[in-house]
């Protein structure tokens, strides 16, 4: 009885109804169900379509632009549970731009376990105000139900019996309104006694077993549930899967051979995107969690000692990284079996992208070659590279080779980075911004000092266009306020003072004191530092009155730590010898200041002598908030309140329904229809700033959702004929 049909994979049914028949024997959809983009379908096409076996969807249900579909009551009459294990943009049920849908009609839907509901832009859709979503899901306040016919108060929603003057359906209170609850004119919403929680109840109102979810055919029997609250095993609902079973997809128990079959099917299929399932914490899951690696003999995830190794074998023994895309193919690799050639001419946000994809590499068995990578400023994106073995060498016996990198200024921050090169030599030619001191430092750190021959490191073509700072600038004065930092540093003059063009002050927010100069920089304009150009001070012949150059940094955030450094800007001297100076990176925190106002104050009186006041912290604390000040003042009573005859006829209903204390505004906004007196004399008040801001935020949120929806559902047609569903990357 429990899940009588098959377990089907997630489905994406689009363009026409042909594939809808694949749902015929499905009791459970393990994944999501998307039905969308059917522009030629008509109401009659759906008349005889019904899938009564479908009880549960484990991820989400999405309906988008399916023409002709007027109700879901016949299509999914027994859909009871949507688990929301994976959501579509935080939603488990999305009904969007369904132009002909008149009612939802999911009259057996009893539980949305995780996520909320988004029902938007369905201009024929009624029977929304008659649904009490709080009986189906917990996070009602996150529901987004707007721009439906229901909004315009044009719906004449009539629950069963109402036409005959009877009330057949249960009524519940939302926002102070006592309303009958139904899905259609012929289907009430089933409301179980509160003590049944989400387990469901029989038609007589007897609670289902605590392991049931949503409904059952007999009370208090875990084999008579319609769906399971926790896990399903051999016809009964169980709290947890007993040995030798494993939890699978958060809803059922499977044995080892089931998990093993999945693992081998994927391993043997070579199909991209499939998962080689493994076992961890009594679960059969797609892959080991971070920090674990699979033991191939028993599929168990075992903790890694240190970071988990992932050995990547390179075809033909080497790989050229010439774009972010090619770098992505090595994402997660910790050991490269082969050699890497980096040849990056351009790209967006390169430093961050390269670090995300190559930042875990610890070891390269062959050589590393950096060639004509005009976009690179630093190699610090190889954040974890510790060993180049040099088992295969570039022609000339080189294990590290850097040629013609026009903007390369730093190899690594050698104060924080260790690199060993087991065998092979270094080669550096035509790296005009790379100071020789950087190269010599690499020789020392990597253990290659003494291996190089005379022409391996070119003295004339490395660092010949760089300001190879050989002096340390010190900050002589640092003064902070809440939004400014005033800095001065010691004067610096090169041998020919005319060579000093000025100073460059670099700064950025730095919550942690772990910043390096080349973090986030590439030669294509990406730079996480804000840079200020500062003219040199007037030069005085009297050394006593030499001004310390400085800068007042303005417009900073209060109570925020900034990383700051300064360097000289000097011209290139004729002798190809460039002087310069640079400070260490210092960290300076701006002062605290007054916080912004506390947000969303709500007051409710819970007795004749008490007022409860709640609020949220300010959006800009601007320091450590230690306490709040609450001011109150007794106000004179409004005499009108005493003079009004409350028995007078014609008193209007309040224009706003009472809301329980501390219910979020959203839940009111999306779950109540407000009475508005449009016939009155009054004109509407102008919108307050906060209302305008809220509307802007809402419209921005709406756009974000629509962008997400379009990005996910519109996929290019597959050129090959295949029936596999698209994988739209649900969140």
């Amino acid at each position: 009885h429990l899940y009588p049909g098959e377990v089907c994979p997630g489905m994406d049914i689009r363009n026409n109804l042909t594939r809808l028949h694949e749902l015929e024997n499905c009791s459970v959809i393990e994944g999501h169900l998307q039905i969308l983009l059917m522009f030629k379908t008509r109401p009659e096409d759906f008349r005889d379509l019904s899938f009564p076996k479908l009880i549960m969807i484990t991820d989400y249900l999405l309906l988008f632009r399916v023409y002709g579909l007027e109700s879901l009551k016949d299509l999914f009459p027994n859909l009871t549970v949507i688990r929301g294990s994976r959501l579509f943009f935080n939603y488990a049920l999305v009904i969007f731009e369904m132009v002909h849908l008149k009612e939802l009609g999911l009259y057996n839907l009893m539980n949305i376990t995780r996520g909320s509901v988004r029902i938007e832009k369905n201009n024929e859709l009624c029977y929304l105000a008659t649904i009490d979503w709080s009986r189906i899901l917990d996070s009602v306040e996150d529901n987004y139900i707007v721009l439906n016919k229901d909004d315009n108060e044009e719906c004449g929603d009539i629950c069963p019996g109402t036409a005959k003057g009877k009330t057949n359906c249960p009524a519940t209170v939302i926002n102070g309104q006592f309303v009958e609850r139904c899905w259609t004119h012929s289907h009430c919403q089933k409301v179980c006694p509160t003590i049944c929680k989400s387990h469901g109840c029989t038609a007589e109102g007897l609670c289902c077993h605590s392991e049931c979810l949503g409904n059952c055919s007999q009370p208090d029997d875990p084999t008579k549930c319609v769906a399971c609250r926790n896990f399903y095993l051999d016809g009964r609902c169980v709290e947890t899967c007993p040995p030798p079973y494993y939890h699978f997809q958060d809803w059922r128990c499977v044995n080892f051979s089931f998990c093993q079959d999945l693992h081998h099917k994927c391993k043997n299929s070579r199909r991209q995107g499939c998962h080689q399932y493994v076992i961890h914490n009594n679960k059969c899951i797609p892959e080991c969690p971070s920090g674990y690696t699979m033991n191939s003999s028993n599929l168990l995830c075992t903790p890694c000692l240190g970071p988990c190794p992932k050995v990547c074998h390179l075809l033909e023994g080497e790989k050229t990284i010439d774009s972010v895309t090619s770098a992505q193919e090595l994402r997660g690799c910790t050991v490269i079996n082969g050699s890497l050639i980096i040849n990056i001419r351009g790209g967006n946000n390169l430093a961050a992208e390269l670090e995300a994809n190559l930042g875990l590499i610890e070891e390269i068995s062959g050589y590393l070659k950096i060639r004509r990578s005009y976009a690179l400023v630093s190699l610090s994106f190889f954040r974890k590279l510790r060993l180049i073995r040099g088992e295969t060498l570039e022609i000339g016996n080189y294990s590290f080779y850097a040629l013609d990198n026009q903007n390369l200024r730093q190899l690594w921050d050698w104060s924080k980075h260790n690199l060993t090169i087991t065998q092979g030599k270094l080669f550096f030619h035509y790296n005009p911004k790379l100071c020789l001191s950087e190269i010599h430092k690499m020789e020392e750190v990597s253990g290659t000092k003494g291996r190089q021959e005379r022409n391996d490191i070119a003295l004339k073509t490395n660092g010949d266009q760089a300001s190879c700072e050989n002096e340390l600038l010190k900050f002589s004065y640092i003064r902070t306020s809440f939004d400014k930092i005033l800095l001065r540093w010691e004067p610096y003059w090169p041998p020919d003072f005319r060579d000093l063009l000025g100073f460059m002050l670099f700064y950025k927010e730095a919550p942690y004191q772990n910043v390096t100069e080349f973090d986030g920089q590439d030669a294509c304009g990406s730079n996480s530092w804000t840079v200020v150009d500062i003219d040199p001070p007037l030069r005085s012949n009297d050394p006593k009155s030499q001004n310390h150059p400085g800068w007042l940094m303005r417009g900073l955030k209060p109570w925020t730590q900034y990383a700051i450094f300064v360097k000289t800007l000097v011209t290139f001297s004729d002798e190809r010898r460039t002087y310069g100076a640079k400070s260490d990176i210092i960290y300076v925190q701006t002062d605290a200041t007054n916080p912004s106002v506390p947000l969303d104050p709500i007051s409710v009186s819970n007795s004749s002598s008490q007022i409860i006041l709640k609020w949220k912290p300010p959006s800009d604390p601007n320091g450590n908030i230690t306490h709040y000040l609450v001011f109150w003042e007794r106000q004179a009573e409004d005499s009108e309140l005493f003079e009004l005859d409350y028995c007078l006829k014609g008193l209007k209903l309040p224009s706003r329904t009472w809301s329980p204390p501390f219910e979020s505004e959203d839940s009111q906004k999306h779950n109540q229809s407000e009475y508005e007196d449009s016939a009155g004399e009054c004109c509407s008040c102008p919108k307050t700033d906060s209302q305008i801001l809220k509307e802007l935020e809402e419209s921005s949120f709406r756009k974000t959702f629509e962008d997400y929806l379009h990005n996910v559902v519109f996929v290019p047609r597959k050129t090959s004929s295949g029936t596999g569903a698209e994988d739209p990357r649900p969140s």
């Epitope: 010190k474 900050f475 002589s476 004065y477 640092i478 003064r479 902070t480 306020s481 400014k484 005033l486 001065r488 010691e490 009155s545 001004n547 310390h548 007042l552 210092i586 960290y587 925190q589 002062d591």
Partner: antibody
């Protein structure tokens, strides 16, 4: 040559007020902080606070907030320290300094009845 | 507030002696420390800024070192004009604070 000259010190009764002046010359007055520091007889140095002539922003040592106020007359390149509700323990030599590098000669304030 | 503790509070030395004065901060101040010399009836005079940089016109017998919380002022060969009181000052965070001073006297 940079010079800072304080004036306005003298004898004042407890509870009284006094305004000290710091006249600056020899540099661009608006670009550098003016700090005030005091030194009680035979004691160490104590920082009072700063004022930035570029925009008039100030910061005070919490100990002096409320009683001491900084102000400026940029046309005269002069900074002022207004001291109210003076106490005997405010007796000290008061210095103004251009960002710690140049100090005035100091002016003595004696609070006594 | 950051406390600066100087030691010793006074010392007697002869001309030509090497003199070391230490200044300990109650928390990390990086390298944001000045050393001043003050003679009776005079304003303080900067000797060293940023822990170790000699201000212009200051004789090279004065040197500073340290970082974090422990700092040192060294006079390599004491001269008659060096007998004075020496103060350290931190400018790492507000309020800026001085050490209590070290008086160097003639033995």
């Amino acid at each position: 040559e940079v010079q800072l000259v304080e004036s306005g010190g003298g004898l004042v009764q407890p509870g009284g007020s006094l305004r000290l002046s710091c006249a600056a010359s020899g540099y661009d007055f608006t670009n550098y902080d003016i700090h005030w520091v005091r030194q009680a007889p035979g004691k160490g140095l104590e920082w009072v606070g700063w004022i930035y002539p570029g925009d008039g922003s100030t910061k005070y040592n919490e100990k002096f907030k409320g009683r001491f106020t900084f102000s400026l007359d940029t046309s005269k390149s002069t900074a002022y320290l207004q001291m109210n509700s003076l106490r005997a323990e405010d007796t000290a030599v008061y210095y103004c300094a251009k960002e710690w590098a140049y100090w005035g000669q100091g002016t003595l304030v004696t609070v006594s009845s | 507030d950051i406390q600066l503790t100087q030691s010793p509070s006074s010392l007697s030395a002869s001309v030509g002696d090497r003199v070391t004065i230490t200044c300990r901060a109650s928390q990390d101040i990086g390298g944001n420390l000045y050393w001043y010399q003050q003679k009776p009836g005079k304003a303080p005079k900067v000797l060293i800024y940023a822990t170790s940089s000699l201000d212009s016109g200051v004789p090279s017998r004065f040197s500073g070192s340290g970082s974090g919380t422990d700092f040192t002022l060294t006079i390599s060969s004491l001269q008659p004009e060096d007998f004075a009181t020496y103060y350290c000052l931190q400018y790492s965070s507000s309020p800026w604070t001085f050490g209590q001073g070290t008086k160097v006297e003639i033995k």
